[in-house]
Amino acid sequence: AAQPNNSLMLQTSKENHALASSSLCMDEKQITQNYSKVLAEVNTSWPVKMATNAVLCCPPIALRNLIIITWEIILRGQPSCTKAYKKETNETKETNCTDERITWVSRPDQNSDLQIRTVAITHDGYYRCIMVTPDGNFHRGYHLQVLVTPEVTLFQNRNRTAVCKAVAGKPAAHISWIPEGDCATKQEYWSNGTVTVKSTCHWEVHNVSTVTCHVSHLTGNKSLYIELLPVPGAKKSAKL
């Protein structure tokens, strides 16, 4: 089957309940063109910030062409949940679906999209829309990766040694320093899937007075700086 090459198309907006909402649908320029009898299986990896709302879309097929629309949801450590709509009888059916935050956007006969209200870490998983037509099935799958913004701290703990921590991020953050020092980085993994990254750096060079910790993460980057306390009795070089 032809495989459309998908690029991310994230739309973010503010809703009434002040939660950012992101919707990932097909980037229309990337659709494969020969779709006569192709049973298309399209999968997209999608990072979504925790505590936002997410909307997942089905392939662009009009309701008049459909027999059944099914959303299949596979979350870690849980039985597969399915939400199905049968057009002929106008009935919806759910199997093993316990999370009330995962729902149809509206009536499935009006909109086949699936929404996740207030995305949590537990929503990490695979979501697939299956559209059954008289001539075969069209699929649209999402590997949903929930992103958690780490809390960043920077402090000096010994002579000319600074510690930068990116606490409970998902995925793990990356820490870099300006200027570079003699650094050691450790990662601590938590049961909920988040990671704490701790970078400890030492600067022997006495003309380094201010250091910056730069934390890179999929949810955004953050920089903090700190003035290194001079070593007692050491001469501090003058800045140009």
Epitope: C57, C58, I61, A62, R64, N111, D135
Partner: antibody, heavy 119, light 110 residues
Framework: QVQLVQSGAEVKKPGASVKVSCKAS????????MHWVRQAPGQGLEWMGY????????NYNEKFKGRVTMTRDTSTSTVYMELSSLRSEDTAVYYC????????????WGQGTLVTVSS | DIVLTQSPASLAVSPGQRATITCRAS??????????MHWYQQKPGQPPKLLIY???NLESGVPARFSGSGSGTDFTLTINPVEANDTANYYC????????FGQGTKVEIK
């Protein structure tokens, strides 16, 4: 390959009915929605409605409701469009067009059937 | 009902130049991230031929001189560069549950 072949030209008197056929080949007939569109001389395209051969569902443009009937014969892979109570302004070329699933686009059209309504 | 308004009604373009046709919908034809707007070319005595689907996708076999853009209510068909055999009528179409065409744009090559 996918093909739609329509019936020949018709001349009808005002008040009469006309039934235009569209024979499909090269695909599973019952799997795809068929639309009907007409075009009066020198005018644009006007959607009349569709029939879904899979379940016999129809949906007509409000303008033609009560005058148009779309049917299908699965044994011959043919759809029909019948327009009744003809008037001179119904003189037009009538086209059938198959809707492709992806994007609801119409990739295959019949060659057109000229219907002339004249007393 | 959604009404589609095309402009201009006609235009004359020299070969090698760019032709731009716009189509405005009375309400959004975009849903779930897709714009259900298509463009067709019709030459005299022939049925329409699909050029662009879902606002910006080139139908198989159509020259890359044709391109489409837009979302929501405003859409554009561009022919660049125009060639002599592009003389035709061009129609935008909204196709989802109730289908509608724009009134057409006649393109003539000078």
């Amino acid at each position: 390959q996918v093909q739609l072949v329509q019936s020949g030209a018709e001349v009808k008197k005002p008040g009469a009915s006309v039934k235009v056929s569209c024979k499909a080949s090269g695909y599973t007939f019952t799997s795809y929605v068929m639309h009907w569109v007409r075009q009066a001389p020198g005018q644009g395209l006007e959607w009349m409605g569709y029939i879904n051969p899979y379940n016999d569902d129809t949906n007509y443009n409000e303008k033609f409701k009560g005058r148009v009937t779309m049917t299908r014969d699965t044994s011959t892979s043919t759809v029909y469009m019948e327009l009744s109570s003809l008037r001179s302004e119904d003189t037009a070329v009538y086209y059938c067009a198959r809707e492709d699933y992806y994007g609801s686009r119409w990739g295959t059209w019949g060659q057109g059937t000229l219907v002339t309504v004249s007393s | 009902d959604i009404v589609l308004t095309q402009s201009p009604a006609s235009l004359a373009v020299s070969p090698g130049q760019r032709a731009t046709i716009t189509c405005r919908a009375s309400k959004s034809v975009s849903t779930s991230g897709y714009s259900y707007m298509h463009w067709y070319q019709q030459k005299p005595g022939q049925p329409p031929k699909l050029l662009i689907y879902l606002a910006s996708n080139l139908e198989s076999g159509v020259p890359a001189r044709f391109s489409g853009s837009g979302s929501g209510t405003d859409f554009t068909l561009t022919i660049n560069p125009v060639e002599a055999n592009d003389t035709a009528n061009y129609y935008c179409q909204h196709s989802h549950e109730l289908d509608r065409f724009g009134q057409g744009t006649k393109v003539e090559i000078k």
